[in-house]
C-alpha cells in the first residue's frame, strides 16, 4: 500500500503566440481546482474509463478576478498535494489524466457552475520511494507544470511497496528469514498477516491468510517437524505433510524479480510473475511498445533493436528524455553572442541584442562609428557595442568637445607644480626631485637616480612631459 502524490506548480499560458484569454473576469470571478485519475500499466487514456489505481480532487484555489486588459497570468492554485492512495502493489508503469476545472462564482442559479478548462494525459514509468519527478504538459494554449512521486505507507517498502517493514524486536538482528529494511536499517522486513495460528518461526505467507511452511516443517500451521528418519536427498520447500527437509531461509530471499514482480521458489531457483507492463524472466524488461504511444511532445517512436528497449523516442528540437518528456533549456547553451539576452519561446529561440549588435544570435557587430563624429580632431574607435572617441591632446569627453585640464589629476609627484601646455603638461619639480612627473629623487652627491640626465637639463629644471 502507498500514496501517489501530485504537486501542481503552475497553470497558465504556454509559451508562444496566441496566449489564452483569462478564464475569469470582473463580471465572472472564478477559482480553479484539479482532478487526477490514475490507471495501472499503459492503459488507454480515455477519460471515461475507470481510474483503476484511484483518483483525487484538489481543494478549490483562491478566487481570481482578471485585471482588465492584462494577459492571462499563471492562475492562483489550491494549496497542498493531491493524494491518491493505492491499496495493492505500485505497478511501476501508470497512465494519468490531470484535469483543470474552473468553478464560476457569478450569480448562477442553483450554485456555482463548473467547466473543464484543460486536460493533460500521459504514460510514465515510476518506482515507488524515488524522488519527485518533474513534468510539463500542454493542453492547447495552456501549460501545466507539476511534480509527482509514489511513496509507500509503512510498513510497506520497496519499488513496488510489496515488502513490509517493522521496528526491530532485537537490537542486533532480524528474525528468521527476515532482512533489514534498506534504507531503514533499524527496521526489519515484516511478514504478511498470515493465517491465524501460523507458526511465526516456521511458517510464512505470500498472500494474506495462507500458511506455507519453511523447509523442515509441515502441518496446516507449520508446527510439525518433518521426520528425518527417511532422509535421502534434501530438496525444495515442503509439499504438504511428507518429505525430508532441512530448515532454511524464507521464500525468494532478496526478491530477485524486478519491477514489482512476485517471486515464488522452485526447488533450485525461483520464478517471477510480472506485473502489467513488464516481462522477461526476471520482469526486467518494460513491455511498453510504440503502440502505447510513449513519446511525448511530437517525438517519433521506433521499435528498439535492443531486447531490453521495446521502443526508442526520437525527440523534436527542444525536448529530451527517454519519452521526450523533458523540455530542453536551450538558453542554457548560451546561444546569444555579445551579451545578448536569450528568450526561449517554445516554438523558437530569440536573442535580444545589446546596442551595437544585431543578427539572429547577435553575432554581427554594427559599425558604431557610422554617422558619428569626434570633435577637435578626435578619432572614433568601435567596440563593445558603443562608439568611443580617442581625443586629441587637450580635449576629452564622449565626443572630445570638452577642453581637458591636464593638471586636474595632479600628475606631478613630490610637490612638483603642474603647468598646462599646448602639447600636454609640464611639471616644475621641487628641489631634490627630477623626471617627467618629478618621480625620481636626486642623490646628495649630485648623481641622479636616472642613468643619465637628458642633455641640456639640470636637476631642478622643469621637465616637460611629452
Amino acid at each position: 500500500a502507498g500514496v501517489f502524490e501530485l504537486q501542481i506548480h503552475s497553470f497558465g499560458p504556454g509559451p508562444g503566440p496566441g496566449a489564452p484569454r483569462s478564464p475569469c473576469s470582473a463580471r465572472l470571478p472564478c477559482r480553479l481546482f484539479f482532478r487526477v485519475c490514475l490507471k495501472p500499466g499503459l492503459s488507454e487514456e480515455a477519460a471515461e474509463s475507470p481510474c483503476a489505481l484511484g483518483a483525487a480532487l484538489s481543494a478549490r484555489g483562491p478566487v481570481y478576478t482578471e485585471q482588465p486588459g492584462a494577459p492571462a497570468p499563471d492562475l492562483p492554485l489550491p494549496d497542498g498535494l493531491l493524494q491518491v492512495p493505492f491499496r495493492d502493489a505500485w505497478p511501476g508503469t501508470f497512465s494519468f489524466i490531470i484535469e483543470t476545472w474552473r468553478e464560476e462564482l457569478g450569480d448562477q442559479i442553483g450554485g456555482p457552475a463548473w467547466s473543464l478548462l484543460a486536460r493533460v494525459a500521459g504514460r510514465r514509468r515510476l518506482a515507488a520511494g524515488g524522488p519527485w519527478a518533474r513534468d510539463i504538459q500542454r493542453a492547447g494554449a495552456w501549460e501545466l507544470r507539476f511534480s509527482y512521486r509514489a511513496r509507500c505507507e509503512p510498513p510497506a517498502v520497496g519499488t513496488a511497496c510489496t515488502r513490509l517493514c517493522r521496528p526491530r524486536s532485537a537490537p542486533s538482528r532480524c528474525g528468521p528469514g527476515l532482512r533489514p529494511c534498506a534504507p531503514l536499517e533499524d527496521e526489519c522486513e515484516a511478514p504478511l498477516v498470515c493465517r491465524a495460528g501460523c507458526s511465526p518461526e516456521h511458517g510464512f505467507c505470500e498472500q494474506p491468510g495462507e500458511c506455507r511452511c519453511l523447509e523442515g516443517w509441515t502441518g496446516p500451521l507449520c508446527t510439525v517437524p518433518v521426520s528425518t528418519s527417511s532422509c535421502l536427498s534434501p530438496r525444495g520447500p515442503s509439499s504438504a505433510t511428507t518429505g525430508c527437509l532441512v530448515p532454511g531461509p524464507g521464500p525468494c530471499d532478496g526478491n530477485p524479480c524486478a519491477n514489482g514482480g512476485s517471486c515464488s521458489e522452485t526447488p533450485r531457483s525461483f520464478e517471477c510473475t510480472c506485473p502489467r507492463g513488464f516481462y522477461g524472466l526476471r520482469c526486467e524488461v518494460s513491455g511498453v511498445t510504440c503502440a502505447d504511444g510513449p513519446c511525448f511532445n511530437g517525438g517519433l517512436c521506433v521499435g528498439g533493436a535492443d531486447p531490453d528497449s521495446a521502443y526508442i523516442c526520437h525527440c523534436p528540437p527542444g525536448f529530451q528524455g527517454s519519452n521526450c518528456e523533458k523540455r530542453v533549456d536551450r538558453c542554457s547553451l548560451q546561444p546569444c553572442r555579445n551579451g545578448g539576452l536569450c528568450l526561449d519561446l517554445g516554438h523558437a529561440l530569440r536573442c535580444r541584442c545589446r546596442a551595437g549588435f544585431a543578427g539572429p544570435r547577435c553575432e554581427h557587430d554594427l559599425d558604431d562609428c557610422a554617422g558619428r563624429a569626434c570633435a577637435n580632431g578626435g578619432t572614433c574607435v568601435e567596440g563593445g557595442g558603443a562608439h568611443r572617441c580617442s581625443c586629441a591632446l587637450g580635449f576629452g569627453g564622449r565626443d572630445c568637445r570638452e577642453r581637458a585640464d591636464p593638471c586636474a589629476a595632479r600628475p606631478c609627484a613630490h610637490g612638483g607644480r603642474c603647468y598646462a601646455h599646448f602639447s600636454g603638461l609640464v611639471c616644475a619639480c621641487a628641489p631634490g626631485y627630477m623626471g617627467a612627473r618629478c618621480e625620481f629623487p636626486v642623490h646628495p652627491d649630485g648623481a641622479s637616480a636616472l642613468p643619465a640626465a637628458p642633455p641640456g637639463l639640470r636637476p631642478g629644471d622643469p621637465q616637460r612631459y611629452l
Epitope: 532454511g248 531461509p249 530471499d253 532478496g254 530477485p256 522452485t266 526447488p267 533450485r268 531457483s269 525461483f270 520464478e271 517471477c272 516481462y279 522477461g280 524472466l281 526476471r282 526486467e284 531486447p307
Partner: antibody
C-alpha cells in the same frame, strides 16, 4: 534421464553468424529453462542467455545485441544464433537445461572456431 | 552487472585435506548462488544450489555456505576424484560465473 544433443557449424569466418541447435531427449520440454554457456579455450565459463518454454528470453548484457535464442517446442529443440562473430567468439559452446539461471543438465559441447 | 570473484585461482592440496574456496559477489545476491565442478574436456556438473543445498547424487563431503556477498565451498576430505576446476555462479540477476579455482595435486 534427460539428454541434450547439440550440433552446428564448427568453423566460421569473421562477420559470419554462428548457429547451433540443441535437441532434448527423454524429458518434458515445458516448465524448464534452456541456456547457452560458452568457454573460450583455457578460460572460464561465460553465460550467454536462456529461454523458457514460452519463448521469454534473458541475455548477457555484453552479448545481447548479437544474440538470438529461440525454442521449437514441437521438436523439443532450442537454438542459438550469434551474429558478426570475431576471433574472440572462439569457444566451446554448451547447451543446458534447468531451472531459471541454474543449468543442471548439460550438452556435450561444440567447439566453434572463428578464423579467416 | 554483478561480478563474481573467486579465490584462490589455484589451490594445491593432498588427498584427505579440507579444502575451502571463497566466492565474493560485487553486490548482494541473497542465496542465489551455485557451485559447479568441471574436469578437462567435460561439461560442468552442478554441486550446490541456493548457496548451501546439495544437488542429488553429490557426495556429502561437499558443502556450501554464505549469503549476501560472501560464499564458500568446502570439501571436507579431498578425494582423488575431486581434483578439478570449481566455478561459482550467481543467478540473482542474469547469470555470472566466477573465474574458476583449479584444485590440483600437491
Amino acid at each position: 534421464q534427460v539428454q541434450l544433443q547439440q550440433w552446428g557449424a564448427g568453423l566460421l569466418k569473421p562477420s559470419e553468424t554462428l548457429s547451433l541447435t540443441c535437441a532434448v531427449f527423454g524429458g518434458s520440454f515445458s516448465g524448464d529453462y534452456w541456456s547457452w554457456i560458452r568457454q573460450p579455450p583455457g578460460k572460464g565459463l561465460e553465460w550467454i542467455g536462456e529461454i523458457n518454454h514460452s519463448g521469454i528470453t534473458s541475455f548477457n548484457p555484453s552479448l545481447k545485441s548479437r544474440v538470438t535464442i529461440s525454442v521449437d517446442t514441437s521438436k523439443n529443440q532450442f537454438s542459438l544464433k550469434l551474429s558478426s562473430v570475431t576471433a574472440a567468439d572462439t569457444a566451446v559452446y554448451y547447451c543446458a537445461r534447468g531451472e531459471l539461471g541454474i543449468p543442471d543438465n548439460w550438452g556435450q559441447g561444440t567447439l566453434v572456431t572463428v578464423s579467416s | 552487472d554483478i561480478q563474481m570473484t573467486q579465490s584462490p585461482s589455484t589451490l594445491s592440496a593432498s588427498v584427505g585435506d579440507r579444502v575451502t574456496i571463497t566466492c565474493r559477489a560485487s553486490q548482494s545476491i541473497s542465496r542465489w548462488l551455485a557451485w559447479y565442478q568441471q574436469k578437462p574436456g567435460k561439461a560442468p556438473k552442478l554441486l550446490i544450489y541456493k548457496a548451501s543445498s546439495l544437488e542429488s547424487g553429490v557426495p556429502s563431503r561437499f558443502s556450501g555456505s554464505g549469503s549476501g556477498t560472501e560464499f564458500t565451498l568446502t570439501i571436507s576430505s579431498l578425494q582423488p576424484d575431486d581434483f578439478a576446476t570449481y566455478y561459482c555462479q550467481q543467478y540473482n540477476s542474469y547469470s555470472t560465473f566466477g573465474q574458476g579455482t583449479k584444485v590440483e595435486i600437491k
